[in-house]
């Protein structure tokens, strides 16, 4: 029997210093470009090799970015989100949501604390 796939969601504050070639990542999402169904959030789609984000090591492809320098990214058009990053200055604080896939045991073998239903 196959195991059930669940997700462990954690949040982290990541402080990046803009490098010579910028922050070094790509984003998808926005109210006009939903990447996840019914979610207009902003997601990291590419970490560029040797860029600031890659060298820092904490930001991951697939992370959802919740805020930039304290400014919420909810309900933004895609280009407005891009512009926010581009104008964020030298020191950039990102609040991000990591979504880690975890494989549970076979279905029917519920562990302690595993919600039923």
């Amino acid at each position: 029997m196959n195991g059930r796939v669940d997700y462990l969601v954690t949040e982290e504050e990541i402080n990046l210093t803009r490098g010579p070639s910028g922050l070094g990542f790509n984003i998808v999402g926005g109210t006009d470009q939903q990447y996840v169904s019914n979610d207009s959030g902003i997601y990291v789609s590419r970490i560029k090799e040797n860029g600031a984000a890659a060298l820092d090591g904490r930001l991951q492809e697939g992370d959802k970015i919740l805020s930039v320098n304290g400014q919420d990214l909810k309900n933004l058009l895609h280009q407005d989100a891009v512009d926010l990053f581009r104008n964020a200055g030298y020191a950039v604080s990102l609040r991000v949501q990591h979504r880690l896939q975890v494989q549970n045991g076979p279905i029917g073998h519920r562990g302690e604390g595993d919600p039923s239903g």
Epitope: N26, V28, Y43, S45, E49, E61, H78, V82
Partner: nanobody, 128 residues
Framework: QVQLVESGGGLVQAGGSLRLSCAAS????????MGWFRQRPGKERDVVAT????????YYLDSVKGRFTISRDNAKNTVFLQMNSLKPEDTAVYYC??????????????????????WGQGTQVTVS
């Protein structure tokens, strides 16, 4: 990292057709820009065709325009290269490539148009 496996290459006569496939795994396919490149004997690797993550923007090498078509099937995590009216000069190893799509948060001029992060092993196409 994205794992890419190409298939569909082979030997074909001039004027014939082939359809290359590239199956991707390792991360969500729907956020990936995909490309087909080729390396002809004794030459450098060249871009043949690309398709962006949303599927609404494609690029073709001038010499294949009107003959080759790139497409993607997000449900099957696969990108295709339909090659028609093949010519002997299309003989090459064809490589599939992937990168995260979307917009760079850096300068809009930070294009790196044909800069891809992950590569397949290649499939040989020979046109006689």
């Amino acid at each position: 990292q994205v794992q890419l496996v190409e298939s569909g290459g082979g030997l074909v006569q001039a004027g014939g057709s082939l359809r290359l496939s590239c199956a991707a795994s390792g991360r969500p396919f729907s956020s990936l820009d995909m490309g087909w490149f080729r390396q002809r004997p004794g030459k450098e690797r060249d871009v043949v065709a690309t398709i962006n993550w949303t599927g609404d923007s494609t690029y073709y090498l001038d010499s294949v325009k009107g003959r080759f078509t790139i497409s993607r099937d997000n449900a099957k995590n696969t990108v295709f290269l339909q090659m028609n009216s093949l010519k002997p000069e299309d003989t090459a190893v064809y490589y599939c490539a992937a990168r995260g799509g979307g917009s760079s948060v850096d300068s809009e001029y930070d294009v790196g148009e044909f800069e891809y992060d992950d590569w397949g092993q290649g499939t040989q196409v020979t046109v006689s």
